[in-house]
């Protein structure tokens, strides 16, 4: 087909010969009034870059991607020639970053409907180059990391040496939808939950007298739960003294709260203090109670079956630790008067 | 999102599993619960799931087991009476807890009857 | 096992009012605010309103409020729509949850 009616977009992949990266190609068809299939609903130009991402609903995956070699011969299929890039749904992937993917681009519509459709393309013109300049020396990462359930931010990697106040205005996306309200090099993410996951991308322009073009990076988001600073913490008992009964059985519970960690080894048990003896007492399995996303509830029972005067002069030790550190409770048993 | 699928007529005593399908959220940090609501009658929490322990409501233990894959969190009524007759809702708590359910599944309806 | 008792239905609103339902727990919630207030309509699945007894859910109208600690907790609707109109549920967790329960549940009915 004739791509000299395709609307034409310029981009920029500066990638760093130190990390492994991705790059993302979206199918930004233009949207001529009068087809439907490029049809979608669009933001006023004030908010949004020259084109959307498309997000027709029923066309998601009916878009071709073609290459056009450098030598001028006929157009070719991505899927057939290139292993290392992947087209999911309208987005093209590229796996490995190299200067071969340099080169021409083109989307569009598997089915042409109307004659409109014809011109409904859109040529990208991709410029790879690796990263130079030294001067940058700490550019975020490609794959950046937020700790869950707490504050974070997400940096675009090209601009991540800027200040907030020299940046230009930035276009972001998350898995392929524009964040309309993000416009910074940095999304502040005030509570960071696992929906916050996924691919994101950034976009700004930059231009000579020339021409201009979109720099664009990839940055894949992971959430993730931090391991706890802490030392478990022992919920119950928490009065050091127990009333009982002489002769009936008792259970004491303790239940510790452990912090979260990856390398999870909760240590939880009963000693007994008589005089200058101490032993631990063989007692029946800890177990966890409760699991939130920061920590974990373990309880673990004493059984006496009868308790004797011995026991009333005897300390019951509660002990419980993990990688930071231990703490103790100890429970005094007294007899109920009356 | 979140859907529960299983839900049919079942006689009495026979084992039923149901299963929630999970899409676009990750399973590994979060409690994903189980909680049923009687044709007519309240809310009843069931249990939950967090990094592959289990949690049964007093009521409920011994009468549910809950396990998950990487994509879908079953719920297996091991010997359904009349009384487990209700809609069955998956859950997910996207705040750290085991109580602030804010993604529900529409409900499957499990109908045990002879 | 834990039990939570709700102000009995049907409580009666007019649109614009205020309306308060109260939930009370036999035993000491989780960390004294691991309570958590959901609405449902016929038909559909719970919306969470509030969790941590008072935080706000996303996307919930700042006229639903929580209150309360330890064992009492109340939920409060000012200028109540006719949309409010639905039955309103606690949820407590506990230091065990095993313990873990809804409240019966409260109507609203909006008039």
């Known amino acids: 087909f004739n791509i000299s009616g395709c609307s034409t977009k310029k981009l920029l992949w500066t990638y760093s010969t130190r990390s492994e990266e991705e790059f993302v190609l979206f199918c930004d068809l233009p949207e001529p009034q009068k087809s439907h299939f490029c049809h979608r609903n669009r933001l006023s130009p004030k908010q949004v870059p020259e084109h959307l991402p498309f997000m027709g609903s029923n066309d998601l995956s009916d878009v071709q991607w073609y290459q056009q070699p450098s030598n001028g011969d006929p157009l070719e299929d991505i899927r057939k020639s290139y292993p290392h890039i992947i087209q999911d749904k309208c987005t093209l992937h590229f796996l490995t970053p190299g200067v071969n993917n340099s080169g021409s681009y083109i989307c569009r519509p598997k089915m042409i409907k109307s004659p409109y459709d014809v011109a409904c393309c859109v040529k990208m013109i991709l410029e790879v180059k690796p990263q130079t300049n030294a001067s940058c020396e700490y550019s975020a990462s490609h794959k950046q990391d937020l700790l869950l359930g707490s504050t974070g931010s997400i940096s675009c990697p090209s601009l991540s040496c800027q200040s907030d106040a020299q940046s230009p205005a930035v276009t972001w996306y998350k898995n392929g939808k524009l964040l309309s309200v993000e416009r910074s090099n940095r999304i502040v993410v005030d509570e960071v939950y696992d929906y916050h996951q996924g691919t994101y991308v950034c976009d700004y322009t930059q231009s000579d007298t020339v021409s201009s073009w979109t720099v664009r990076a990839v940055v894949q988001v992971r959430t993730i739960v931090g391991d706890t600073k802490l030392k478990p913490d022992i919920l119950d008992p928490v009065e050091d003294t127990l009333e009982v009964e002489l002769g009936k059985p008792l259970t004491i519970s303790c239940k510790a709260r452990f912090g979260f960690e990856r390398v999870f080894n909760p240590v939880i048990k009963w000693y007994i203090k008589d005089s200058d003896l101490e032993w631990e007492v063989s007692v029946p399995e800890a177990k966890s109670i409760k699991s939130t996303l920061k920590d974990e509830i373990i309880e673990r029972n004493i059984i006496l079956e009868k308790v004797t005067q011995r026991d009333l002069r005897r300390k019951f030790v509660c002990f419980v630790q993990n990688s930071i550190g231990n703490t103790t409770q100890s429970v005094q048993l007294k007899e109920k008067r009356g | 999102s979140l859907e529960e699928s299983g839900g049919r007529l079942v006689t009495p005593g026979t084992p039923l599993t149901l299963t929630c399908t999970v899409s676009?959220?990750?399973?590994?940090?979060?409690?994903m619960g189980w909680v049923r609501q009687a044709p007519g009658k309240g809310l009843e929490y069931i249990g939950y799931?967090?990094?592959?322990n289990t949690y049964y409501a007093n009521w409920a233990k011994g009468r549910f087991t809950i396990s998950k894959t990487s994509t879908t969190v079953d719920l297996k009524i091991t010997s359904p009476t009349t009384e487990d007759t209700a809609t069955y809702f998956c859950?997910?708590?996207?705040?750290?807890?085991?109580?602030?359910?804010?993604?529900w599944g529409p409900g499957t309806l499990v109908t045990v009857s002879s | 096992a834990a039990v939570l008792t709700q102000t009995p239905s049907p409580v009666s609103a007019a649109v614009g009012g205020t309306v308060s339902i109260s939930c009370q727990s036999s035993?000491?919630?989780?960390?004294?605010?691991?309570l958590s207030w959901f609405q449902q309509k016929p038909g559909q699945p719970p919306k969470l309103l509030i969790y941590?007894?008072?935080t706000l859910a996303s996307g919930v109208p700042s006229r639903f409020k929580g209150s309360g600690s330890g064992t009492q907790f109340t939920l409060t609707i000012s200028d109540v729509q006719c949309d409010d109109a639905a039955t309103y549920y606690c949820?407590?967790?506990?230091?065990?949850?095993?313990?873990?329960?809804f409240g019966g549940g409260t109507e609203v009915v909006v008039k």
């Open positions: 941590g007894a008072s």
């Open positions: 676009g959220i990750d399973l590994s940090s979060y409690a």
């Open positions: 799931i967090n990094r592959g």
């Open positions: 859950a997910r708590d996207s705040y750290g807890g085991d109580y602030a359910f804010n993604l």
């Open positions: 035993k000491t919630i989780y960390n004294d605010n691991w």
């Open positions: 949820l407590g967790s506990y230091i065990n949850s095993s313990d873990n329960a």
